[in-house]
């Protein structure tokens, strides 16, 4: 059985479209499961992995490897 584009699995009922945009950064494996691109995490692969050591409480990142501090916090790790 050949599935339509972006459909996978037995019965072709698993849908996965690779994307690399605001809504996700992932490829699809042979079973139609998302595999996050390097630097991204979460079920939709749309959460950037911040700089190692970045404070989870006082820092965040829009892009992988960043560490942007909340107001009132500073330093390489916002700690």
């Amino acid at each position: 059985v050949t599935c339509d584009d972006y459909y996978y699995g037995f019965g072709c009922n698993k849908f996965c479209r690779p994307r690399d945009d605001f809504f996700g950064h992932y490829a699809c494996d042979q079973n139609g499961n998302k595999t996050c691109m390097e630097g991204w995490m979460g079920p939709e692969c749309n959460r950037a992995i911040c700089r190692q050591g970045c404070s989870p409480k006082h820092g965040s990142c829009k892009l992988p490897g960043d560490c942007r501090c909340q107001y009132g916090w500073q330093g390489l790790y916002c700690d």
Epitope: D4, D5, Y6, F15, C16, R17, D21, F22, F23, G42, P43, E44, N46, R47, A48, C50, S60, C61, K62, L63, D66
Partner: antibody
């Protein structure tokens, strides 16, 4: 279960701003972007934009760029939509909405917030 | 931006009728299409996603089909609770635009 609870109705003057909140529960707030959709009385649905609460990244419909600001507070799992320079045409119900799991579109919706703009 | 054109804008039908609503995208959206049902004063409810997959707890009388730019929502046998407004929406790329809606009324 996933729940999105929005703030109450607002009556605003033309030229002012409004800030609508959407408190999320039942899932990890930073895992999914929060979208905002509005519906003017008797009209259709209009996508305004979305925010990724984890890092604060945003995407806006061209029509609203410069006038809408989406923010999120991770500590309270609350998303906010602020619309400035209000005019009568902005009178609408504003919804926050979230994708479902595994690439669904908008499976979860807030109850809606009516914003009335009138002098 | 991809535009969605939905037809008809309104439709009168009777309980038991088979009803079809169509949605045309201005570009290929690769099955990234959803259908919603909305009743007055309520938030929209997801019916179908990825063009043909029924959302949780949606009755099997609803079905979706299509590919490329042309998509269809079919209700095989109308029930009283189906009278509502229906919207299509693409989610291929931002902005995720909606069709203008189809109001389904009792004949």
């Amino acid at each position: 279960q996933v729940q999105l609870v929005q703030s109450g109705a607002e009556l605003k003057k033309p030229g002012s701003s409004v800030k609508v909140s959407c408190k999320a529960s039942g899932y990890t707030f930073t895992d999914y972007e929060m979208h905002w959709v509005r519906q003017a009385p008797g009209q259709g649905l209009e996508w305004m934009g979305a925010i990724q609460p984890g890092g604060g990244g945003t995407a806006y419909a061209q029509k609203f760029k410069g006038r809408v600001t989406l923010t999120a507070d991770k500590s309270t799992s609350t998303a906010y939509m602020e619309l400035s320079s209000l005019r009568s045409e902005d009178t609408a119900v504003y919804y926050c909405t979230r994708r479902g799991y595994d690439d669904y579109p908008f499976a979860y919706w807030g109850q809606g917030t009516l914003v009335t703009v009138s002098s | 931006d991809i535009q969605m054109t939905q037809s008809p804008s309104s439709l009168s039908a009777s309980v038991g009728d088979r009803v079809t609503i169509t949605c045309r995208a201005s570009g290929n959206i690769h099955n990234y299409l959803a259908w919603y049902q909305q009743k007055p004063g309520k938030a929209p409810k997801l019916l179908i996603y990825n063009a043909k997959t029924l959302a949780d707890a949606v009755p099997s009388r609803f079905s979706g089909s299509g590919s490329g730019t042309d998509y269809t929502l079919t209700i095989s046998s109308l029930q009283p609770e189906d009278f509502a407004t229906y919207y299509c929406q693409h989610f291929w790329s931002a902005p995720w635009t909606f069709g203008q809606g189809t109001k389904l009324e009792i004949k």
